[in-house]
């Protein structure tokens, strides 16, 4: 099966690697411009120069292209606790990343917030906190996982999972209650 | 107690607008940033959008960029959705929810009020 090629594309692929096709002349390719730049006025004609503009301050491209337009910089977010870790230029859109000690939980493809690594107080450390991914804890004996914090087994209900890790320890409790009644 | 409860929804036709509200209590609205998602039938949780405490600074998901609007009146302690051109896929629970701080979950969000678009 031949993959279906938009309409761009299919312009692109007529004319060799770097050219694009001339939208009113479809027997001219026009050379594409350079990343950090943009297309202005398509080239008059074949072998002549296609009109580049760099992109203005808070936009960029980043790749070779005959955008009309250059990409808006994205905007770090605050209130997902994201910090700059390298600014906009012409060619280069601002990267984004989370403080010393936290990590990228993505809600989506393209948006993440940061949250704090675990600890792993009244644990250990089974695998270490990773850009994209939280601290994995092992908790001590008496202590159960929940929501990756170790949690003390004498606030495990019956109903919850944590049941099978907090046995022995329920065992105790109701056997302590139980010795206590005369 | 915190409580979230969303109001708005019904069944409306494709390219028909419907306009969400999430009324807050329990907790001070005004310094929390807040959240819209939605679970299509059958699929996970999508966010859809979220608004800074003053309402300054929104996210919307591709799906609904240029047709949802989201806006918040602190003094009402009232979160919005505006859903315009709505399309038979935009067909889910909507839910409201404060953005999660400690870790990756709400720690508080509403029932949630169905949005059926079909024609």
């Known amino acids: 099966l031949v993959p279906h090629l938009g309409d761009r594309e299919k312009r692109d692929s007529v004319c060799p690697q770097g050219k694009y096709i001339h939208p009113q002349n479809n027997s001219i390719c026009c050379t594409k411009c350079h990343k950090g730049t943009y297309l202005y006025n398509d080239c008059p004609g074949p072998g002549q120069d296609t009109d580049c503009r760099e992109c203005e301050s808070g936009s960029f491209t980043a790749s070779e292209n005959h955008l009309r337009h250059c990409l808006s910089c994205s905007k770090c977010r605050k209130e997902m606790g994201q910090v700059e870790i390298s600014s906009c230029t012409v060619d280069r859109d601002t990267v984004c990343g989370c403080r010393k000690n936290q990590y990228r939980h993505y809600w989506s493809e393209n948006l993440f917030q940061c949250f704090n690594c675990s600890l792993c107080l009244n644990g250990t450390v089974h695998l270490s906190c990773q850009e994209k991914q939280n601290t994995v804890c092992t908790c001590h004996a008496g202590f159960f996982l929940r929501e990756n914090e170790c949690v003390s087994c004498s606030n495990c209900k019956k109903s919850l999972e944590c049941t099978k890790l907090c046995l022995p320890q329920i065992e105790n409790v109701k056997g302590t209650e139980d010795s206590g009644t005369t | 107690e915190v409580q979230l409860l969303e109001s708005g929804g019904g069944l409306v036709q494709p390219g028909g607008s419907l306009r969400l509200s999430c009324a807050a209590s329990?907790?001070?609205?005004?310094?929390?940033?807040m959240v819209w998602v939605r679970q299509a039938p059958g699929k996970g949780l999508e966010w859809v959008s979220h608004?800074?405490?003053?309402?300054?600074?929104?996210y919307y998901a591709d799906s609904v960029k240029g047709r949802f609007t989201i806006s918040r009146d602190n003094s009402k302690n009232t979160l919005y959705l505006q859903m315009n051109s709505l399309r038979a896929e935009d067909t889910a629970v909507y839910y409201c929810?404060?953005?999660?701080?400690?870790?990756?979950?709400?720690?508080?969000w509403g029932q949630g009020t169905l949005v059926t678009v079909s024609s």
């Open positions: 929810a404060s953005l999660p701080k400690r870790g990756p979950r709400f720690d508080y």
């Open positions: 329990g907790f001070t609205f005004a310094h929390e940033p």
């Open positions: 608004i800074d405490r003053v309402g300054q600074d929104t």
